[in-house]
């Protein structure tokens, strides 16, 4: 369910009206701080036992327009010798994010919120052995 | 060639004004479809060689108000015997997402876009051995 932010400032706000049409400032506010962002390593994609590649997904009618999506490089994981281990699977970790999609032909621009499932990276899991009946 | 979806611009739209104050419909449109969402495995966090836990992060002045954040269970990775491997590190895969933060005391509600760095899951990487000078 969509949660309506708590506020004492707007008594008797009709939830359906509130959700339908809110004003948003799309200038991104960087709450992370430069240090936090710069500490985030981007080399895990090569060093992981389940390495991945990043693919550029651009949609000019979406906010954010550019999203980089992960895809696992191999079906299996890479062992200490650099070989593929057939007992271990490389699997995609996905996250559901919210994006804004521009309403077609809207001038001035209006947006709606959409859910999007994006691959973020890969992890290594033991293969599940299916027992024969 | 990968085609970027087409968009019709608004002639004479002042881009800086456009970003400053847009209308958004916060009723979430599920572009994923129920099947996609329900097929997404959620047991990787336990089965991974770099397992993680999920922690609930709630902010009533944020949209979405609830975000689940990953934290790695161990500093090291778990080997085939279920023991911690001191040559392998369990590291957090983070993703930068955009959230809407309600402007304080705004009536009717207005929001600004904020960046947030969230942990999504963990992956296993070889420890980097620092050479002594």
């Amino acid at each position: 369910a969509a949660i309506i932010p708590q506020s004492s400032a707007c008594p008797n706000t009709e939830a359906k009206d509130f959700l339908q049409n809110v004003k948003v400032n799309l200038k991104v506010f960087n709450s992370l701080g430069a240090k936090v962002s710069s500490r985030r390593p981007s080399d895990y994609l090569n060093r992981s036992t389940s390495p991945w590649t990043l693919h550029r997904n651009e949609d000019p009618d979406r906010y954010p327009s550019v999203i980089w999506e992960a895809q696992c490089r191999h079906q299996r994981c890479v062992n200490a010798e650099g070989k593929l281990d057939h007992h271990m699977n490389s699997v995609l970790i996905q996250q559901e994010i919210l994006v804004l999609k521009r309403e077609p032909e809207s001038c001035p621009f209006t947006f709606r919120v959409e859910k999007m499932l994006v691959g973020v990276g890969c992890t290594c899991v033991a293969s599940i052995v299916r027992q024969a009946a | 060639a990968a085609i970027i979806p087409q968009s019709s611009a608004c002639p004479n739209t002042e881009a800086k004004d456009f970003l400053q104050n847009v209308k958004v419909n916060l009723k979430v449109f599920n572009s994923l479809g129920a099947k996609v969402s329900s097929r997404r495995p959620s047991d990787y966090l336990n089965r991974s060689t770099s397992p993680w836990t999920l922690h609930r992060n709630e902010d009533p002045d944020r949209y979405p108000s609830v975000i689940w954040e990953a934290q790695c269970r161990h500093q090291r990775c778990v080997n085939a015997e279920g023991k911690l491997d001191h040559h392998m590190n369990s590291v957090l895969i983070q993703q930068e997402i955009l959230v809407l933060k309600r402007e304080p005391e705004s009536c009717p509600f207005t929001f600004r876009v904020e960046k947030m760095l969230v942990g999504v899951g963990c992956t296993c990487v070889a420890s980097i051995v620092r050479q002594a000078a």
């Epitope: 799309l26 991104v28 960087n30 430069a34 962002s37 710069s38 981007s42 080399d43 994609l45 990043l54 693919h55 550029r56 651009e58 000019p60 906010y63 954010p64 327009s65 550019v66 980089w68 | 060639a1 990968a2 085609i3 970027i4 979806p5 087409q6 968009s7 611009a9 608004c10 002639p11 004479n12 739209t13 881009a15 970003l19 930068e96 955009l98 876009v113």
Partner: antibody, heavy 121, light 106 residues
Framework: EVQLVQSGAEVKKPGSSVKVSCKAS????????IHWVRQAPGQGLEWIGV????????FYNQKFDGRATLTADKSTSTAYMELSSLRSEDTAVYYC??????????????WGQGTTVTVSS | DIQLTQSPSSLSASVGDRVTITCSAS?????IYWFQQKPGKSPKRWIY???ELASGVPSRFSGSGSGTDYTLTISSLQPEDFATYYC?????????FGQGTKLEIK
């Protein structure tokens, strides 16, 4: 003030590699991708590829795939373009330019001053 | 690859003239971008998203078009407008540029 400051001119031998830097200032480095474009003497503009400093993602014009390597160092807000196996046709001015990740409407808005790479035996 | 063909390749005009440069794409594209470049200088974003004038660009410039045909128009040419103009598309990979239109003083 937004600035993209590139490294100085280079003269290289055929078969060697060159690494050009592009130091960004005046904005949040990770909010923008860095694209690289080159211009041979008296010629038009040619897109090489893109690097996303935030995620580390790269995407190349197939013409340069395997020879160009785009990287970025978030701690110094610097992007790099390395081109290997240089040949005389790679003699050009190389430009870095930024591209807003959130709203691509703006396109490539600020450009570096360019780095001249001359490949000659 | 999407080819962008600019016409004319070069153009001699006088101060005060109305000038139109066209850019024709080999396939339909969403937006066109225009860059101005002067000798020995970096390209400057001039018109973005087909219609929008970049900061500092005089209002005598305008952009229009859709699909495969786009134009840059200067309503009354000024001395500082003499330069090379490139169109650019980012609707399909690889991103491409037109061959350029060199605007010279008659």
């Amino acid at each position: 003030e937004v600035q993209l400051v590139q490294s100085g001119a280079e003269v290289k031998k055929p078969g060697s590699s060159v690494k050009v830097s592009c130091k960004a200032s005046g904005y949040t480095f990770t909010d923008y991708e860095i694209h690289w474009v080159r211009q041979a003497p008296g010629q038009g503009l040619e897109w090489i590829g893109v690097n996303d400093p935030e995620s580390g993602g790269t995407f190349y014009n197939q013409k340069f795939d395997g020879r160009a390597t785009l990287t970025a160092d978030k701690s110094t807000s610097t992007a790099y373009m390395e081109l290997s196996s240089l040949r005389s046709e790679d003699t050009a001015v190389y430009y870095c330019t930024r591209y807003y990740r959130y709203e691509s409407f703006y396109g490539m808005d600020y450009w570096g001053q360019g780095t001249t790479v001359t490949v000659s035996s | 690859d999407i080819q962008l063909t600019q016409s004319p390749s070069s153009l001699s005009a006088s101060v005060g003239d109305r000038v139109t440069i066209t850019c024709s794409a080999s396939s339909s594209i969403s937006y066109i971008y225009w860059f101005q470049q002067k000798p020995g200088k970096s390209p400057k974003r001039w018109i973005y998203a087909t219609f929008e004038l970049a900061s500092g660009v005089p209002s005598r410039f305008s952009g229009s078009g859709s699909g495969t045909d786009y134009t840059l128009t200067i309503s009354s040419l000024q001395p500082e407008d003499f330069a090379t103009y490139y169109c650019h598309q980012r609707s399909s990979y690889p991103w491409t540029f037109g061959q350029g239109t060199k605007l010279e003083i008659k």
